[in-house]
Interface confidence: medium
């Protein structure tokens, strides 16, 4: 289960994003257009720092389907 | 120096299960992820997996699911891939690779690689 | 077949420019951070270019990388025959079973 105190990297932080992801796929970086401001990728933000689960879920490739 | 050194050469017969070793040294072994690539003769690189040796976290390539297993002996500063149910197309050379995730996703030390034959 | 696309060999004659492409999708290339090796014959491979277009220390600069949508291209300048390898592209897929993915390998001839 994703602990959201703890900090994420390699293979540990792509096993977390398959899990919170699921079949939506997931991105190391944001496609440019869907942020407003450069970032510079899910390293930064949950490897060297920790980070929460809806940040992790802002890496999915494509929304949720709403129920 | 950092390197990374892998097991002898191993012959094995189908069906069989090989383990193949990886002794780290002039870094901290938990601090990195350890991967696991392979190559068939005159073929490309081809990987199999990762493991954390800190937690023992691994995720593997579903192409290998249910035949590989990665472990760990960080008093050791070892890393350990079994490969099971050998078949003549597991003939390759096998290699470990460091991790550093800090690098964004390149592993920059290599071992110098371990060839295992499956012949019967 | 490999996720990733590599010619599957280039040639150059020594002192000339050469460029190495490698194309993916979203799921891999365009979204995540690229990594090159080379793989001199006999040996392992050695990271050459990391995150798209750093090279790690003791690496000249007469390697370069570079991404754009979803390819990325290896530049090799001043071509050597010690650069007379196997090359390889490899990143990230983050489909549905995530893992590392390579470049079928592309082979320089330094003519």
């Known amino acids: 289960a994703y602990r959201p105190s703890e900090t994420l990297c390699g293979g540990e932080l792509v096993d977390t994003l398959q899990f919170v992801c699921g079949d939506r796929g997931f991105y190391f970086s944001r496609p440019a257009s869907r942020v407003s401001r450069r970032s510079r990728g899910i390293v930064e933000e949950c490897c060297f720092r920790s980070c929460d689960l809806a940040l992790l879920e802002t890496y999915c490739a494509t929304p949720a389907k709403s129920e | 120096q950092v390197q990374l050194v892998q097991s002898g050469a191993e012959v094995k017969k189908p069906g069989a299960s090989v383990k193949v070793s990886c002794k780290a040294s002039?870094?901290?072994?938990?601090?990195?992820?350890i991967n696991w690539v392979r190559q068939a003769t005159g073929q490309g690189l081809e990987w199999m997996g990762w493991?954390?040796?800190?937690?023992?976290?691994?995720g593997y390539a579903q192409k290998f699911q249910g035949r590989v297993t990665m472990t760990r002996n960080t008093s050791i500063s070892t890393a350990y891939m079994e490969l099971s149910s050998l078949r003549s197309e597991d003939t390759a050379v096998y290699y470990c690779?460091?991790?550093?995730?800090?690098?964004?996703?390149?592993?920059?030390?290599w071992g110098q690689g371990t060839t295992v034959t499956v012949s019967s | 077949q490999s996720v990733l696309t590599q010619p599957p060999s280039v040639s150059a004659a020594p002192g000339q420019k050469v460029t190495i492409s490698c194309s993916g999708s979203?799921?891999?290339?365009?979204?995540?951070?690229v990594s090159w090796y080379q793989q001199l014959p006999g040996t392992a491979p050695k990271l050459l270019i990391y995150?798209?277009?750093k090279r790690p220390s003791g690496i000249p600069d007469r390697f370069s990388g570079s991404k754009s949508g979803t390819s990325a291209t290896l530049g090799i300048t001043g071509l050597q025959t010690g650069d007379e390898a196997d090359y390889y592209c490899?990143?990230?897929?983050?489909?549905?079973?995530?893992?590392?993915?390579f470049g079928g390998g592309t082979k320089l001839t330094v003519l």
């Open positions: 690779a460091r991790d550093p995730y800090y690098y964004y996703y390149g592993m920059d030390v």
């Open positions: 002039g870094y901290t072994f938990t601090s990195y992820d």
């Open positions: 493991m954390n040796p800190n937690s023992g976290n691994t």
């Open positions: 979203s799921s891999n290339i365009e979204n995540n951070h």
């Open positions: 995150d798209n277009n």
């Open positions: 490899e990143t990230w897929d983050t489909s549905l079973s995530a893992g590392r993915v």
